[in-house]
Interface confidence: medium
């Protein structure tokens, strides 16, 4: 089955960069968003710090670390109130991600 232009393969995501001219000259605003084409039973999430289609049960039960959201070599730690997770780098630096 061939994909039309701009069509994503099932179960994949891509990062879309939105460029927008500011009212002020020489200032350009850039923001990124993800576009996903997830299969049934999947939902957009994060794997290895990149957008990915993940098992919807992970989101439902807030088992965020089961998405493998951190980079290789980092440790994932679920926030106790299940509002997100932390990724701990080998050097000890901690990055916290919360889900709204």
């Amino acid at each position: 089955q061939f994909l039309k232009e701009g069509q994503l393969a099932a179960g994949t995501c891509e990062i879309v960069t939105l460029d927008r001219d500011s009212s002020q000259p020489r200032i350009e605003e850039r923001s990124q968003t993800a576009r996903c084409a997830c299969r049934k039973g999947q939902i957009a999430g994060t794997t290895r710090a990149r957008p990915a289609c993940v098992d919807a049960r992970i989101i439902k039960t807030k088992q965020w670390c089961d998405m493998l959201p951190c980079l290789e070599g980092e440790g994932c730690d679920l926030l106790i109130n299940r509002s997100g997770w932390t990724c701990t780098q080998p050097g000890g630096r901690i990055k916290t991600t919360t889900v709204s």
Epitope: Q63, G75, D77, L78, L79, I80, R82
Partner: antibody, heavy 122, light 110 residues
């Protein structure tokens, strides 16, 4: 084999403070969230609180909230429960518990310590 | 917050089912913990709905039907006589997610 060894229990006075320590072995301690569960004499199990892997996040049951502090030392493979302003209702056996996955809940405990008995009495 | 029968009894070799319902986080599953005497430590027989620790006999199993979780002991033995607690999580705005346990079911092997 996974072992959790609690210490620090004994007779305590009302209004005082206690410090319980759980020494873990047989698994990679820093990879698991840990918790404390207690049991009053002749009663059921009661959730005390939990701590995440790095020690940066904790949560406590309503009966001890504001009086309890859980901390951990991943280098020493220990988790500590400090309980202040002790009451007679704090009497019971305190168990250290290990989570089975990347988190600990009352559904995911896969190992328990033998327990340490605490008696709060004047 | 978790409801389980106060007692069940069975003859050796029979199948025993202990139910547990309620709790605030059914998505997070249920655990089952065996305590043989009030002074002994609990032993995990089932965690995360149906996972069994490697040292627990295969006669112990866990299952879910709707909002009720069931611990099944197929071919109960005398040494299975104990109190069984189910565990789950509940959510409150002041404490967040906090573990809850049932009051315990006393299994008597006749």
């Amino acid at each position: 084999a996974v072992t959790l060894d609690e210490s620090g229990g004994g007779l305590q006075t009302p209004g005082g403070a206690l410090s319980l320590v759980c020494k873990a072995s047989g698994f990679t301690f820093s990879s698991y969230q840990m918790g404390w569960v207690r049991q009053a004499p002749g009663k059921g199990l009661e959730w005390v609180g939990v701590i995440n892997k790095s020690g940066s996040d904790t949560s406590y049951g309503s009966a001890v909230k504001g009086r309890a502090t859980i901390s951990r030392d991943n280098g020493q493979s220990t988790v500590r429960l400090q309980l202040n302003n002790l009451r007679a209702e704090d009497t019971g056996t305190y168990f250290c518990a290990k989570g089975s996955a990347s988190y600990i809940t009352a559904a995911t405990i896969d190992a328990w310590g033998h327990g340490t008995e605490v008696i709060v009495s004047s | 917050a978790l409801t389980q029968p106060s007692s069940v009894s069975a003859n050796p070799g029979e199948t025993v089912k202990i139910t547990c319902s309620g709790g605030g986080s059914s998505g997070y599953g249920y655990g089952w913990y065996q305590q043989k005497s009030p002074s002994s430590a609990p032993l995990t027989v089932i965690y995360w709905n149906d996972k069994r620790p490697s040292d627990i006999p295969s006669r112990f199993s866990g299952s879910k039907s709707g909002s009720t979780h069931t611990l099944t002991i197929t071919g109960v033995q005398a040494e299975d006589e104990a109190v069984y607690f189910c565990g789950n999580d509940d959510y409150s705005s002041d404490s967040g997610y906090v573990g809850v346990f049932g009051a315990g079911t006393t299994l008597t092997v006749l």
